[in-house]
Amino acid sequence: AGVFELQIHSFGPGPGPGAPRSPCSARLPCRLFFRVCLKPGLSEEAAESPCALGAALSARGPVYTEQPGAPAPDLPLPDGLLQVPFRDAWPGTFSFIIETWREELGDQIGGPAWSLLARVAGRRRLAAGGPWARDIQRAGAWELRFSYRARCEPPAVGTACTRLCRPRSAPSRCGPGLRPCAPLEDECEAPLVCRAGCSPEHGFCEQPGECRCLEGWTGPLCTVPVSTSSCLSPRGPSSATTGCLVPGPGPCDGNPCANGGSCSETPRSFECTCPRGFYGLRCEVSGVTCADGPCFNGGLCVGGADPDSAYICHCPPGFQGSNCEKRVDRCSLQPCRNGGLCLDLGHALRCRCRAGFAGPRCEHDLDDCAGRACANGGTCVEGGGAHRCSCALGFGGRDCRERADPCAARPCAHGGRCYAHFSGLVCACAPGYMGARCEFPVHPDGASALPAAPPGLRPGDPQRYL
């Protein structure tokens, strides 16, 4: 886990001729704010795709009023950093979109109006824990200067925030096989949750240090396929010493589960599904209340204040069962495309892609774009054996060579007027409507009928989903 931090240094006219007009005027004072959208790895920069790594919105900047006759200066900026927390590993390569928004503070009916001034996008390589990286991006006549970094939240460390650190228990050395946590030399790597080297495909753990194997696999790290060729009978459980399915009674023979629990075989043992009010390896623990902490894997316990009343466990994603004791096989939904191998890591799903495919779900065909070029800043997107270009704003066609008329599709709703603009299009809404496409009616009380805001946006913020 960690935080991506973005510091905006300046937003103003870029170098060269054709300085932009100030976005604010004496009649229409305004202020700026910024939105950042992050996506992992080689994802498309298309504005519509979700901000899978997260998004953040800045505070509003100071109110600015243009001085008549003066050229547009660098505009006053909001204070502070934009911070995008990430829960899993930092991916190393990421795509970003930074939008500059204008909030007009004139006598608007129904409150302030927002419009998108500029959008910049890029793809970068960045290691967590490194220094601030500086960048300059241009959007039409505007120029945005900013810095960014990714930092890990303790106890995570490393370039991907995947190693854990904790204070050393002894002054001079770390635990067996563990290294000091540079640059925190007074701390040590914490042991991995599972046994170090435990196969992510075929092993899992429920306690630190364990490496329990899925059916068909054996060995200390679950890397050895079970061989049935030298066995008398294809019945479990798996023998630790031979790596062979050995004959013998099944682990559920005689039902080891007490109090009406039902038994099911697992690769190495058995598992009891207990009726409510009982838990434990064999459903032997009874009279349970929430005070006993019967919900596993971060489940939330509700009810059951006294032993006679039942409790209910509300399970977090990925777990089920009356005590959240069962891991959901999320790979059964076959989320990986193009023959990719699905890995359920507990905290996340990962797809291991076949050669020639990439992307979080193996959805990108890597060969399609070989030797292809998209003009005017367009990005080549793989898929289905034929490349296509995701064009920069203002361009279209198969190779982004044609100037697009963004207003041709009449995108402004409710009688709004469309203006072609360097960053796409701008809608001037008819009275009583607001939003990037004039899609939201303004209520008489000043509130807007906006849909539920995505993370990082409050209702009432610009509904320009990326």
Partner: antibody, heavy 117, light 107 residues
Framework: QVQLQQSGAELMKPGASVTLSCKAT????????IEWVKQRPGHGLEWIGE????????NYNEKFKGKATFTADTSSNTAYMQLSSLTTEDSAIYYC??????????WGQGTTLTVSS | DIVLTQSPATLSVTPGDSVSLSCRAS??????LHWYQQKSHESPRLLIK???QSISGIPSRFSGSGSGTDFTLTINSVETEDFGMYFC?????????FGGGTKLEMK
């Protein structure tokens, strides 16, 4: 400093049982495996098995099943190996070692067991 | 059980020489092979883990290579403190097994 401190030498009679201890200092046991290894002159090193303290996980070499039993007390940071029905073949140096993977990263100084009538 | 065969059984060298010790497995152990040094009346000490990973505190003259069934421990420019027994160990499957050892002695 990471150390595994093993109990002292033992002289036992055939048929008896003995419990050897291995106390870890410099880190806490849960999450790390304790491995037990036997060394006899002319027989090299033999892996007896392993235990994950704080859990029910243990793996035994088939050859030592019924001979060795592993336990651990996480409150005292100590692992134990009981050897039963001793014979002269059990005379050896017994090492404990610690790991969070499968390499034997740190070793105790060894306990010499002599079985003699 | 997986059998590890070390060769040669004894290696006589002069300080300053570079030597290679071999460990061959009866079946593939992937890279789950580790090397240990044991001096007389001392406990074994881990030198290399997972075939080629170096260990903090172990001199850089020790290096490991190989995967599958054939592995090599190389000592560049042997020093007098390096004499003793060297064992390989596989942890790809239970039971873990050790090689019979190579004795490195002074010529």
């Amino acid at each position: 400093q990471v150390q595994l401190q093993q109990s002292g030498a033992e002289l036992m009679k055939p048929g008896a049982s003995v419990t050897l201890s291995c106390k870890a200092t410099g880190y806490t046991l849960p999450g790390y495996w304790i491995e037990w290894v036997k060394q006899r002159p002319g027989h090299g090193l033999e892996w007896i098995g392993e235990i994950l303290p704080g859990s029910s996980s243990a793996n035994y070499n088939e050859k030592f099943k019924g001979k060795a039993t592993f336990t651990a007390d996480t409150s005292s940071n100590t692992a134990y190996m009981q050897l039963s029905s001793l014979t002269t073949e059990d005379s050896a140096i017994y090492y404990c070692a610690s790991t969070y993977g499968t390499s034997l990263d740190y070793w105790g100084q060894g306990t010499t067991l002599t079985v003699s009538s | 059980d997986i059998v590890l065969t070390q060769s040669p059984a004894t290696l006589s060298v002069t300080p300053g020489d570079s030597v290679s010790l071999s460990c061959r497995a009866s079946q593939s152990v992937s890279n789950d092979l580790h090397w240990y040094q044991q001096k007389s009346h001392e406990s074994p000490r881990l030198l290399i883990k997972y075939a080629s990973q170096s260990i903090s505190g172990i001199p850089s003259r020790f290096s490991g290579s190989g995967s599958g069934t054939d592995f090599t421990l190389t000592i560049n420019s042997v020093e007098t403190e390096d004499f003793g027994m060297y064992f390989c160990q596989q942890s790809n499957n239970w039971p873990y097994t050790f090689g019979g050892g190579t004795k490195l002695e002074m010529k």
